[in-house]
Amino acid sequence: ELCDDDPPKITHATFKAVAYKEGTMLNCECKRGFRRIKSGSPYMLCTGNSSHSSWDNQCQCTSSAARNTTKQVTPQPEEQKERKTTEMQSQMQLADQVSLPGHCREPPPWENEATERIYHFVVGQTVYYQCVQGYRALHRGPAESVCKMTHGKTRWTQPQLICTGETEPSQFPGEEEPQASPDGLPESETSR
């Protein structure tokens, strides 16, 4: 069951998922000047069986100007640098080692991918929040949100994180204070 809404926003914070539940969809979005190849899927889908989960379909972008040329899926280093998420991903190398049953890991970037990833989450998904660079956690209760089904409607729980503008950036829960830790392994930035 897809969650009706995006996870809650927290001012001066971003959220990440450690892993994505089966059924999660990721839009195949291309950066400006590029478009999805005609035969390409509009989204990637996390699917799996009891022992293994992986992303179905591959996102591929081609130049809007070019005809019949398909870009490779493997990203060039320059392309990766352009992605806003790269900085945060690089902090989270540990996440590559995580393997949750019934979950997919962050899909690798594809060439000419848009700067923001748009996910469509399913019931049971948890996302984790951190204050952005230059802000710190005034209060850090459970800095997470879970998509739950109540009375036939989906609802994200409210993270109890308040970020305030001070020079020192705050850490992810688990890096400093263990109370709200998702096993200390938050992963990729998600935008929706």
Epitope: K9, T11, L138, H139, G141, Q158, Q160, L161, I162, Q179
Partner: antibody
């Protein structure tokens, strides 16, 4: 069930200080920040500030800066709001409210400032 | 500071009516908006958070909408217990300011 229970009504003279308490129960006290809001007779709601029940760190509304002090006692799951240099216009009902979205409120504490 | 302006400031309606209260922020606050109901002599009660999410235990006749600067609280069919004062409030950033309130009275 979640409850925020505040201390009783107070009558104070101008220039004095008042300290209002708010005891949380039915949940993990340090998970939720505590806000303080006041309401003068016949008026609307006015946000005074917020304190982290985890760290004790607080942010105050500019209007109350220098006159208000918010503290917490984790051992008793109690938040406190002290307002000093009281004047007649501080006569109001003072509320504590829990968390980012103020999902639970105390019953209110009436503070009357009168000479 | 962000100013929150509610309209109307008072409203007369009858049981069964559909009622709409609006709240305007002085700057874009995305969906960082709550609605509260307050009855005389009582503490406010959370109705809607994050602009449109119904708080636990709140009847489904209450709904919220809007994003950016313009927000709406709708009561689809007024019940006798709904006559009260309603406040909007943002939690975009400190200070968290409230609207001046809308008093909903029986016609």
């Amino acid at each position: 069930q979640v409850q925020l229970v505040q201390s009783g009504a107070e009558v104070k003279k101008p220039g004095a200080s008042v300290k209002v308490s708010c005891k949380g129960s039915g949940y993990t006290f340090t998970d939720y920040a505590m806000h303080w809001v006041r309401q003068a007779p016949g008026q609307g709601l006015e946000w005074m500030g917020v304190i982290s029940t985890y760290s004790g760190d607080a942010i105050y509304a500019q209007k109350f800066q220098g006159r208000v002090t918010m503290t917490v006692d984790k051992s008793t799951s109690t938040a406190y709001m002290e307002l000093s240099s009281l004047r007649s216009e501080d006569t109001a009902v003072y509320y504590c409210a829990r968390g980012v979205t103020f999902d639970y409120w105390g019953q209110g504490t009436t503070v009357t400032v009168s000479s | 500071d962000i100013q929150m302006t509610q309209s109307p400031s008072s409203l007369s309606a009858s049981v069964g009516d559909r009622v709409t209260i609006t709240c305007r922020a002085s700057q874009d606050i995305s969906n960082y908006l709550e609605w509260y109901q307050q009855k005389p002599g009582k503490a406010p009660k959370l109705l809607i958070y994050n602009a449109k999410t119904l708080a636990e235990g709140v009847p489904s006749r209450f709904s919220g909408s809007g994003s950016g600067t313009d927000f709406t609280l709708t009561i689809s069919s007024l019940q006798p217990e709904d006559f009260a004062t309603y406040y909007c409030q943002h939690h975009y950033d400190t200070p968290y300011t409230f609207g001046q309130g809308t008093k909903l009275e029986i016609k």
